[in-house]
């Protein structure tokens, strides 16, 4: 057992197995479930995390839609197919040959079909609205302090560039965080807003994905911000294609 082995961990993803067997004896970490090598300096993609999570599935969630084109993760957990870069494959199928198309955050954006279903491209989710309600406090948080704290959180904990936090809205007790990131805006090395939102969602639930870190401790000017519930809405660059039957 060497010092190199002690140092060889994945700070940004505890759902990994690490060993100093990379090129030149360097540390290499692989995601559970897929065995894909991950970059531990940044967030692991949601697809690889969902795949790893399937060993301990949780109950499915049901969210609400704010408008006709916003998607919510109504389908709960599934074992996704990821491409070599860890992104969701545009078409996902289950063991019973039921298939559907997903967006870049892995949320279904078409009706379910059979193996003949075609998903031409992975459609990017470019706008995410995180809707939070915080526990009652003696007084409302100062909006600009709250804004600064949430931007700091997304930069420092989730490595997301502040330019992708489009806005923070606040009407006590509701906080809305808007993340926006078009395909053209996302440079190599930039954290994807979908991955940042997923890490945040897990943090809020007390299911931190970070290695050996305490859970999320959000404070605004020293006052704890405790989240009661979270709803996340996803807007794609191309609107989803559902049949009228689903909309009624």
């Amino acid at each position: 057992h060497t010092a190199a082995q002690d140092n060889c961990t994945c700070p940004t993803n505890k759902m990994t197995v690490c060993s100093p067997d990379g090129p030149g004896g360097r540390c290499q970490c692989r995601a559970l479930g897929s065995g894909v090598a991950v970059d531990c300096s940044t967030l692991t993609s949601k697809c690889l995390l969902l795949k790893a999570r399937m060993s301990a599935p949780k109950n499915a969630r049901t969210l609400v839609r704010p408008n006709e084109h916003a998607l919510v993760d109504n389908d709960g957990l599934y074992d996704p197919d990821c491409d070599p870069e860890g992104r969701f494959k545009a078409r996902q199928c289950n063991q019973t040959s039921v298939c559907w198309c997903v967006n870049s955050v892995g949320v279904r954006r078409t009706d379910k079909g059979d193996l003949s279903l075609r998903c031409d491209e992975l459609v990017r989710t470019h706008h995410i609205l995180i809707d939070l309600r915080h526990r009652p406090t003696a007084s409302a948080f100062n909006h600009s302090d709250l804004d600064a704290e949430l931007r700091r959180l997304f930069r420092e904990r989730y490595r997301l560039h502040p330019k992708f936090v489009a806005a923070v809205h606040y009407e006590q007790p509701t906080i809305q965080i808007e993340l926006r990131q078009n395909t053209s805006q996302k440079a190599a090395g930039d954290v994807d807003i979908g991955d940042a939102a997923y890490y945040f969602e897990r943090d809020v639930k007390g299911e931190s994905l970070f290695q050996g870190r305490g859970g999320l401790d959000l404070r605004v000017r020293g006052e704890p911000l405790q989240v009661e519930r979270t709803l996340i809405y996803y807007l794609d660059e191309i609107p989803p294609k559902f049949s009228m039957k689903r909309l009624t």
Epitope: T2, N7, C8, T16, C27
Partner: antibody, heavy 122, light 109 residues
Amino acid sequence: QQLEESGGGLVKPEGSLTLTCKGSGFDFSGTYWMWWVRQAPGKGLEWIACIYVGSGSSTYYASWAKGRFTISSTSSTAVTLQATSLTAADTATYFCARGATNNVFMNYFNLWGPGTLVTVSS
Amino acid sequence: FEMTQTPSSVSEPVGGTVTIKCQASEDISSNLGWYQQKPGQPPKLLIYGASTLASGVPSRFKGSGSGTEFTLTISDLECADAATYYCQTSYYIDDGVNGFGGGTEVVVK
């Protein structure tokens, strides 16, 4: 724990060179970033590039350094910086430094090498 | 993104106090370090996280500030404090910008 740079010296304009940073007393397979910083004679400090030496090998470059400088880590004991198309403006002492945290955006440098002088002149 | 350090040079007597300011063009929270560099030597970390003293650094060195305005105060100046001081952040490193301030030369009379 210490760092040492090597590979500096006199280079002709438009020439190339490779600088190496070796660590002793610790392993480069930790969860931190290694950085190259330079300082022209009588001038301030200027960041060039950094690389994550844990799992992943992520890199970042200063805007002016992209395409001309390449940082790499091929082993658990060394980080290299390759430079091409050198000009007199690249004459400087080149330092390697170890970042103290896993998070590149919250990094500060708690261990520095003594530096190696690169002179670009015909 | 830019780090602006002032003044570029300051001269104070032994026992005096020097204040160096560093201004970030964008909010960097508390992610600022201060370094001391003497001629022919590499920089030495003094303060990180805007106000936390690095190991072995005397308490005469004090860092403060957050957001965009930061200060390094050196009190009870000693001859050994004569050096150039730099502030630094890596908060916007993905924009490819230099996170170092321009430096402040401290002369101890």
